[in-house]
């Protein structure tokens, strides 16, 4: 492991469309690939009328956009799908939406998927 | 060096089978989704169909579901496309293609292509 | 299924030029997004996956941008190799689908 670096091994999994799709809903995924390559999680989900509806989390392959962040955030101004990326077992677990945009102080709202 | 060899194209009447295979060789096959991707001659790329690495999961565009069947030997290093009711429109080049597992899956690797023409 | 349109279907350009290609969603699909060079009788090749990475090997010229609906493909500075159709792929569903194309042709 290079120093000052979280080695991503293994990320939450979640599958909104898994029964289409013929996969587990929830479980771990290990992350694997070239060893010259970084992995990370990430995470997508919509808001719905203030409900937040999980669609996907996994493995993410190697990404700048995600390299050095420990934490989950969607930083985009209300997007139709919240995405977010980050480095580290199982970083995904929570993730959160902090607007750059905004004007005002942002809320955080962390998510926890709920067991099937 | 990392390569994928289609084979099994041909000349086939409307109404016949075929079945494509795509040998893959240089990487661990068993580690990559596959995919067949084809294209209709001066046409565009058309997504066919994907398989997960254990072949698990098996996933369809409309225009060829309940007519194709992918699968996949990770015995042999091999990948399958069985087309059966072939029409006209599916006279195209089909390419094999290979994905990584994780998101968001792009296609990484492609063969050569394997022309597939369905003419009476 | 998601419809992937690209803009412009086809387009003139000199060695040297900037030029952009377009994709737009039918429907957000996140950075799930590809792009990919394809050359006469040649099978394509993978330029830029999730939306704005540099797939290995592909000249720093190339570039992507986007996320949900809206999406971007630049090369700064066109080269002769460069002489090619450029496709759009989502992946955010498991249904793929591809765009249109956009065709570069020499002015």
């Known amino acids: 492991a290079i120093l000052g670096r979280s080695e991503t091994q293994e990320c939450l999994f979640f599958n909104a469309n898994w029964e289409k799709d013929r996969t587990n809903q929830t479980g771990v995924e290990p992350c694997y690939g070239d060893k010259d390559k970084r992995r990370h999680c990430f995470a997508t989900w919509k808001n719905i009328s203030g409900s937040i509806e999980i669609v996907k989390q996994g493995c993410w392959l190697d990404d700048i956009n995600c390299y050095d962040r420990t934490d989950c955030v969607e930083k985009k101004d209300s997007p139709e799908v919240y995405f977010c990326c980050c480095e580290g077992n199982m970083c995904n677990e929570k993730f959160s939406y902090f607007p750059e945009m905004e004007v005002t102080q942002p809320t955080s709202n962390p998510v926890t998927p709920k067991p099937p | 060096e990392v390569q994928l060899l289609e084979s099994g194209g041909g000349l086939v009447q409307p109404g016949g089978s075929l079945r494509l295979s795509c040998a893959a060789s240089g990487f661990a096959f068993s580690s990559y989704a596959m995919g067949w991707v084809r294209q209709a001659p001066g046409k565009g790329l058309e997504w066919v169909s994907s398989?997960?690495?254990?072949?698990?999961?098996?996933y369809y565009a409309d225009s060829v579901k309940g007519r194709f069947t992918i699968s996949r030997d990770n015995s042999k290093n091999t990948l399958y496309l069985q087309m059966n009711s072939l029409r006209a429109e599916d006279t195209a080049v089909y390419y094999c293609a290979r994905s990584p597992a994780h998101s968001p899956h792009p296609f990484d690797i492609w063969g050569q292509g394997t022309l597939v023409t369905v003419s009476s | 299924d998601i419809q992937m349109t690209q803009s412009p279907s086809s387009l003139s350009a000199s060695v040297g030029d900037r030029v952009t290609i377009t994709c737009r969603a039918s429907?957000?699909?996140?950075?799930?997004l590809n792009w990919y060079q394809q050359k006469p009788g040649k099978a394509p090749k993978l330029l830029i996956y999730?939306?704005?990475n540099l797939q290995s090997g592909v000249p720093s010229r190339f570039s992507g941008s986007g996320s949900g609906t809206d999406f971007t493909l630049t090369i700064s500075s066109l080269q002769p190799e460069d002489f090619a159709t450029y496709y759009c792929q989502q992946s955010y569903s498991s249904l793929f689908t591809f765009g249109g194309g956009t065709k570069v042709e020499i002015k």
């Open positions: 429907q957000s699909v996140s950075r799930f």
């Open positions: 999730a939306a704005s």
């Open positions: 398989i997960s690495t254990s072949g698990g999961s098996t």
